[in-house]
Interface confidence: low
């Protein structure tokens, strides 16, 4: 017991009080057990279980006995402590689950309810596919799903572990932003370790951001406590929430959370496909039924909003499928590994001068043909994971293949005496993997009736919960408004961000002779008067904007200088600061042909007479640096005519590219763009550079870039992006789409080698597409990394566009 707490006080009349008593007084709230600060009689008075959690016919009208867990006496309704099935068993009412679905047009709440309360019913390890078990196993959950708003699945954040995800649900922040980067983590500044089972987790210093209960409290909205000590039975948690709902107006919270450790506990033990999983799922459903019957008994079933949500899924994993680092490294005793479904490596000794992350990565990269993990420096992880920008994330990260584990050495893996594993399921893998997806259902007056919505990410829920409670969200990683389609009425109406820098529209300003690029093609142009003709074309806007910017010109959301450059086949927003386009947009029809590039054009570029020589790149920089080459944002292979091909070789279409990366980029441009255009009846492509040297997921300022690329006149991008848009209905061509849009985006790491792909020595057709799928991304990720705003001019509503921007194409099979 804590020396500060006098536990001799009593919990009489104080069970599950909402105000946490401070030392030296003992506590009676639902977390006092975790803090070992409960009053001596907490168990006796607050955790009663006598006669169980249900009324039976013989209990109806019983004489009140205060020892009972819940009551079936005539006065229990008035006193707000009936068992949840009292009216069903004793008064002939129907169970909530047996009533028909009803559309709740407006919340019907008893007197004094200022807003519909929100109950967040969170379940640990609820894999999305469990919902397929349907009403035979989970009738209550199935009714919530079919009568309310649901998605086929909800995407957790990486790593797909409990603490990072529960806290993301509460804050709308990625783990790198809120600080809970794992169930276990080491903070080098605190020189302390956070564990699920240790006391350190109670220290506020680990928890960043603003969780929903604080947002609510700061804005004068009462919040019930969100956490439950594991010893408190689920039924008691439900009864407590129901009792809180009967409190006087000035005491009653508006938001409540329930948490179930199941089905995670059973999922680990039996695996997600074990027949033993049926019972824990029935148990959870029974608790949902108790909640809904209890709400109906209080006449709150058409008042409250209920969110039924999981933290992550569950995969079939056993200890027989474990990769041991001792098979790759000689010095595993010098490292600390956070093991399991992901690996995080740091030196065992602080300030170890010999510890070399790059050397360790070299020893772990592509060493075995059947290797089941891939090592990354954290800044090289796919940007969609948002898992780098925190000192608690170790420099070396191992992405582990689904169904596998990683450990330091065989001795680190515990087995039963029989040699069998202690577990058959686990989670933590890449958050786009099917088995890691979890459940979302919204039910109540504010959610739409009988509505299925596309999958979305759990970072988006904090904003929705704020909307449900009439709160202004704290800054977070969600895109407010992107889930407006879940709600019957929207209190928040998103607005497009203001364009900060408007572009210049330069005409032909300079002479051919003004330029000395050091690699010009113009001496190859025959006849010579054709040169003037080619340059004059650059002044012609024509209908390029309508053809190549199908969704409006991207807006630049920071102060800079850039030019709009029109061409027959593409359009660019050319940066006078970075000496390359911020974006290049082009539309490729289904019929487009891929043509070859004449030899004489393959190693030279043309000056662009619209842009000052001082704002143009110079080939000398590339000639002097053998490690660097250049590529083109608009692919010359897709030029519509021999004349138009010359536009593709303008210096203003040129970007610095490592030779290794050019293999990826050229295959994408030459093969994949055409493939997508054929499959999707044409596509619009917007590509450009990304600068994220400090790996914070945000656009680097000019000054920040200068810190990292000293002495180079041309800043080298850390990544290149591409946004590929078509009509969702492939019968309509991309440029004549009047229905919803379909988008797939990529953020490709710009690296001097292709070692991420172990078979990169083979033909590009064998590995490039896989690499791109690994680095799939949301448009929103690209917007943050570029400070650009896309899709500004469409016939679709702005919330619909935000939904599109937050979509992630996972390339996974159906759930």
């Amino acid at each position: 017991d804590s020396p500060w707490t006098n536990i001799s006080g009593s919990c009489k009349g104080r069970c599950f009080e909402l105000q946490e008593a401070g030392p030296p007084d003992c506590r009676c709230d639902n977390l006092c057990k975790s803090y070992t600060s409960c009053c001596h009689d907490f168990d006796e008075l607050c955790l009663k279980t006598a006669r169980g959690w249900e009324c039976t016919k013989d209990r109806c009208g019983e004489v009140r006995n205060e020892e009972n867990a819940c009551h079936c006496s005539e006065d229990c309704l008035a006193r707000g402590d009936c068992c949840t099935n009292y009216q069903v068993v004793c008064k002939g009412e129907s169970h909530w689950v047996d009533d028909d679905c009803e559309e709740i047009k407006a919340a019907e709440c008893p007197a004094g309810f200022v807003r519909p309360p929100l109950i967040i019913f969170s379940v640990d390890g609820f894999r999305a596919s469990y919902m397929k078990k349907g009403s035979k196993v989970m009738p209550n959950i199935e009714k919530l799903r079919s009568c309310g708003t649901h998605s086929p699945y909800m995407r957790p954040v990486y790593p797909t572990k409990t603490f990072p995800n529960l806290y993301t649900l509460a804050t709308g922040l990625y783990p790198e932003s809120h600080g809970i980067v794992g169930n276990s983590m080491y903070d080098p500044v605190f020189d302390a370790t956070f564990h699920l089972r240790g006391r350190e987790k109670f220290n506020h210093r680990w928890w960043g951001g603003q969780p929903l209960w604080i947002t609510a409290t700061k804005q004068g909205v009462k919040a019930g406590t969100f956490f439950w000590s594991v010893v408190i039975p689920h039924e008691r948690r439900i009864l407590t929430i129901l009792q809180w709902l009967t409190l006087p107006d000035h005491e009653r919270p508006s938001v409540y959370a329930f948490y179930s450790e199941q089905p995670d506990f059973s999922g680990h033990k039996y695996g997600p496909f074990g027949p033993e999983m049926t019972n824990p799922l029935r148990e959870i459903d029974k608790i949902v039924g108790q909640l809904m019957d209890g709400l109906k008994q209080l006449k709150l079933h058409r008042c409250v909003n209920v969110i039924f949500v999981g933290d992550h899924g569950m995969e079939d994993v056993t200890c027989d499928r474990t990769e041991f680092l001792s098979n790759y490294l000689t010095n595993v005793d010098d490292i600390t590994l956070v093991p399991g479904t992901l690996g995080r490596i740091r030196s065992k000794f602080s300030n170890n001068a010999k510890y070399d992350p790059k050397a360790i990565i070299a020893n772990l990269t592509c060493k075995k043909p059947d290797q089941h993990f891939k090592p990354y420096l954290k800044q090289h992880l796919p940007k969609r994971l948002h898992y780098a920008n925190n000192r608690r994330i170790e420099d070396i990260h191992l992405l582990v293949e689904r169904r596998w584990h990683v450990a330091r050495k065989p001795l680190d893996v515990y087995k039963k005496p029989s040699g069998k594993c202690f577990f058959q399921g686990d989670h933590g893998f890449d958050n786009k993997v099917n088995s890691m997806q979890t459940v979302f259902v919204g039910y109540g007056s504010t959610f739409k009736y009988k509505t299925k919505v596309p999958p979305f990410e759990n970072i988006e829920l904090y904003n929705v919960m704020c909307d449900l409670l009439g709160l202004k969200p704290a800054p977070n990683n969600g895109t407010h408004g992107s889930l407006n389609h879940l709600l019957r009425t929207n209190t928040f109406r998103p607005t497009m961000p203001e364009e900060v820098t408007r572009p210049n529209y330069p005409g032909i300003m300079y002479l051919q002779s003004d330029f000395d690029l050091g690699c010009t093609c113009d001496d190859k142009v025959e006849p010579k008067n054709k040169l003037d003709e080619l340059n004059k074309r650059l002044h012609t806007k024509g209908s390029t904007e309508e053809r190549h910017l199908l969704y409006g010109r991207p807006a630049v959301l920071y102060r800079t200088r850039y030019d709009i450059l029109y061409h027959t086949d593409f359009e660019s927003g050319y940066s006078e600061i970075f000496l390359m386009p911020l974006w290049t947009s082009y539309t490729v029809s289904k019929q487009a042909e891929v043509s070859s590039v004449p030899d004489h054009l393959t190693s030279c570029v043309r000056p662009d007479v619209r842009v000052s020589p001082s704002f143009s790149q110079n080939c000398l920089a590339y000639k002097n640096d053998k490690q660097m080459s250049y590529g083109f944002l608009f692919p010359p292979y897709l030029s519509s005519s021999p004349e138009a091909k010359y536009d593709a070789f303008l210096v203003t279409n040129m970007v610095p590219m490592y030779p290794a990366f050019k293999r990826v980029w050229n295959y994408f441009q030459r093969v994949l763009v055409k493939k997508y255009a054929s499959e999707r009846n044409g596509v619009n492509v917007i590509s450009g550079p990304i600068f994220d040297y400090d790996y914070d997921g945000l656009h680097d300022t000019e000054d920040k870039i200068k810190q990292y690329v000293e002495g180079s006149s041309i800043p080298v991008p850390t990544h290149y992006y591409s946004i590929i848009t078509s009509c969702l209905d492939f019968t309509q061509p991309a440029d004549k789409c009047d229905g919803p849009l379909s988008v797939s985006s990529f953020i490709l790491p710009h690296r001097p080698d292709n070692e991420e792909s172990c078979n990169s020595s083979e033909d590009e057709s064998k590995w490039v597409e896989e690499l791109m799928k690994m680095h799939t991304a949301r448009v929103r990720d690209i917007e943050h990394l570029t400070s650009l705003d896309f899709f500004r001019k469409t016939s679709r509503s702005y919330p619909e566009i935000l939904t599109l921007k937050t979509y992630l194409h996972t390339y996974e099979s159906e759930i």
Epitope: L77, E93, D99, A106, A107, E108, C109, V114, T489, T491
Partner: antibody, heavy 116, light 107 residues
Framework: EVQLVQSGAEVKKPGESLKISCKGS????????IGWVRQMPGKGLEWMGI????????RYSPSFQGQVTISADKSISTAYLQWSSLKASDTAMYYC?????????WGQGTLVTVSS | EIVLTQSPATLSLSPGERATLSCRAS??????LAWYQQKPGQAPRLLIY???NRATGIPARFSGSGSGTDFTLTISSLEPEDFAVYYC?????????FGQGTKVEIK
């Protein structure tokens, strides 16, 4: 379809008692609140009170507390508004409506005239 | 109790004109506000609920806006059948209350 049908017009003398009714159909009567609204001649709408027929839970506006009684008989899906002693100032049109957050369904109204 | 004040009391307009009716609450009602139309001898009809949502079957010329204490009902182009009395009603505080009404009459 949801319907609320009210009893016919009434002419009464001051001091007399009266009970008017509102019969609900086309929905689960016991699980929706029913409200009563008064409209005096040439005046606006006034919210009187509400009842949940499932368990007869009743709420009144302070202005009408003790002046009227709201009740319901769930066996015949009917809600009632009654006066034990009418006054001339009770002359008005009375509407029943469902539910009470937003009144999306209304009865046709019952005109009560109290005159000596 | 929450008092709702509607303005103006009377609005004289011609068919085809735009009507803007205001409803102000004595304290915040969030977005829990409805608008009704009542014609002589008829029961009120729900037009807008939750401040800005059109009820089933209500023409698009009716729109609601606002939250907190200030709300507006707009009829973009008056039709002959729109001349009536309009009431706002809050469902945020107890007791539920109505505004005193705005009469929209033909000029």
């Amino acid at each position: 379809e949801v319907q609320l049908v009210q009893s016919g017009a009434e002419v009464k003398k001051p001091g007399e008692s009266l009970k008017i009714s509102c019969k609900g159909s086309g929905y689960s009567f016991t699980s929706y609140w029913i409200g009563w609204v008064r409209q005096m001649p040439g005046k606006g709408l006034e919210w009187m009170g509400i009842i949940y027929p499932g368990d007869s839970d009743t709420r009144y506006s302070p202005s009408f507390q003790g002046q009227v009684t709201i009740s319901a008989d769930k066996s015949i899906s009917t809600a009632y508004l009654q006066w034990s002693s009418l006054k001339a100032s009770d002359t008005a049109m009375y509407y029943c409506a469902r539910p009470y957050g937003t009144f999306d369904y209304w009865g046709q109204g019952t005109l009560v005239t109290v005159s000596s | 109790e929450i008092v709702l004040t509607q303005s103006p009391a009377t609005l004289s307009l011609s068919p085809g004109e735009r009507a803007t009716l205001s409803c102000r609450a004595s304290q915040s009602v969030a977005d829990s506000l409805a608008w009704y139309q009542q014609k002589p001898g008829q029961a009120p009809r729900l037009l807008i609920y939750k401040a800005s949502n059109r009820a089933t079957g209500i023409p698009a010329r009716f729109s609601g806006s606002g939250s907190g204490t200030d709300f507006t009902l707009t009829i973009s182009s008056l039709e002959p059948e729109d001349f009536a009395v309009y009431y706002c009603q809050q469902s945020n505080g107890w007791p539920r209350t109505f505004g005193q009404g705005t009469k929209v009459e033909i000029k």
